[in-house]
């Protein structure tokens, strides 16, 4: 069928394939120090690692892409590791009238796949 | 704000940045020749090209990723060009009783962004 089963074990060795990883960043790193009060140090999870053939394929398109990349590597890029879902996080903002809380739904990755 | 405006003009030159491109493929390329009918090559659209800083950022996460990649390129990958939406397409399947139609919602990319 069009939807061959995506592979879930990494053929490249532990930690090499697409996975979620925690990255530390300061407000200065993000250019946010003038308008975010808290947290000062952010723990962000990001999707990193390679996407070997059919590993964690996001969907049918990603499977086709993997297959065509094998046949036409100069024309079709390999799938790459991107968020499949996000975790909402709350930031404390400076505002004209003081401070407010704002939820961001698309800031921290919760899961990853190859797209 | 967290959501700086994503850039929409390509600083690398025409056709170099993340965009939708049509790719030709045969049923044999896709491993579909035993179960899909098609009198001619298939046309597929895929997302190709680079994602320079803040170009077509998918969301806040992608903007953060771009910024951290600039600071920690060994640890944080650059955003990459993936589908933002898909176009439903119909495939003609061989079945035991003849031929039938099936719609796939995630086979052909309709738009691209940097995630």
């Amino acid at each position: 069928s069009a939807h061959a089963h995506p592979r879930d074990s990494c053929p490249l060795g532990p930690g090499r394939c697409c996975h979620l990883e925690t990255v530390q960043a300061t407000l200065e790193d993000l250019g946010w120090s003038d308008w975010v009060l808290s947290p000062r140090q952010l723990q962000l999870s990001m999707c990193v690692g390679e996407c070997p053939h059919l590993y964690r394929s996001a969907n049918t398109h990603a499977q086709i892409k993997a297959r065509l990349h094998g046949l036409q590597p100069d024309k079709v890029p390999a799938p790459c590791c991107v968020p499949s879902s996000y975790t909402p996080v709350v930031l404390m903002h400076r505002t004209d009238s003081g401070v407010s809380l704002q939820t961001y739904d698309d800031l921290v990755a919760r899961g990853c796949h190859c797209a | 704000s967290a959501h700086a405006h994503p850039r929409d003009s390509c600083p690398l030159g025409p056709g170099r940045c993340c965009h939708l491109e049509t790719v030709q493929a045969t049923l044999e390329d896709l491993g579909w020749s035993d179960w899909v009918l098609s009198p001619r090559q298939l046309q597929l659209s895929m997302c190709v090209g680079e994602c320079p800083h803040l170009y077509r950022s998918a969301n806040t996460h992608a903007q953060i990723k771009a910024r951290l990649h600039g600071l920690q390129p060994d640890k944080v990958p650059a955003p990459c060009c993936v589908p933002s939406s898909y176009t439903p397409v119909v495939l003609m399947h061989r079945t035991d009783s003849g031929v039938s139609l099936q719609t796939y919602d995630d086979l052909v990319a309709r738009g691209c962004h940097c995630a």
Epitope: - | T22, M92, R110
Partner: antibody
């Protein structure tokens, strides 16, 4: 809901060209295949060709190859059909019709149609 | 090129079942669609892929296809079903092909 609105009736001289437009609303224009089908007075339906905006490619029925050009403008969600070297036998109602993209076949399953444009070729 | 042959006309008594045929070489191995066209109007898709109906098309309309004949069946025919009906499939190079059309007359 989806609507296809075509340009108005035309009267043309033999040997000239005609260009008919078809403006789509209420759907994602680039996600579908747009065909042109004609119907001569008292006759049946005849597929002329079509275009898939997302791929930017047109296909034509062999009978019309070289005489018909089908284009699409995504910015206005409009498809166009230009027929050249007109003769009296080209007098017909010209319909645009939309359907899903059928991989490898491209066109068919026309689930929405324009209202039709009458083109009369007469000297 | 692939040809589809339909009878020029079919008559049915009000409330009875009408059958409109569409013949083509080994048409049973093709996908066939059917369109209804009333005078002065654009065609409407009524059946596709054997016997699927688009939304808004009554269950009275059904299709079948085997061997060299595809059939559109209209049960409990109504005066409003009076129209021209066209079958459609594809030729060997993937071009759209229509049948010549059948005029359905509902008597009574």
């Amino acid at each position: 809901q989806v609507q296809l609105v075509q340009s108005g009736a035309e009267v043309k001289k033999p040997g000239s060209s005609v260009k008919v437009s078809c403006k789509a609303s209420g759907g994602t224009f680039r996600s579908y295949a747009v065909s042109w089908v004609r119907q001569a007075p008292g006759q049946g339906l005849e597929w002329m060709g079509g275009i898939i905006p997302i791929f930017g490619t047109a296909n034509y029925a062999q009978k019309f190859q070289g005489r018909v050009t089908i284009t699409a403008d995504e910015s206005t969600s409009t498809a166009y059909m230009e027929l050249s070297s007109l003769r009296s036998e080209d007098t017909a109602v010209y319909y645009c019709a939309r359907g899903p993209i059928i991989m490898g076949y491209q066109f068919g399953l026309f689930d929405h149609w324009g209202q039709g444009t009458l083109v009369t070729v007469s000297s | 090129s692939y040809e589809l042959t339909q009878p020029l006309s079919v008559s049915v008594a009000l409330g009875q079942t009408a059958r409109i045929t569409c013949s083509g070489d080994n048409i049973g191995s093709h996908i066939v669609s059917w369109y209804q066209q009333k005078p002065g109007q654009a065609p409407v898709l009524v059946i596709y892929d054997k016997s699927n109906r688009p939304s808004g098309i009554p269950e009275r309309f059904s299709g079948s296809n085997s061997g060299n004949t595809a059939t559109l069946t209209i049960s409990r025919a109504q005066a409003g079903d009076e129209a021209d009906y066209y079958c459609q499939t594809w030729d060997s190079i993937g071009s759209v092909v229509f049948g010549g059309g059948t005029k359905l007359t509902v008597l009574g």
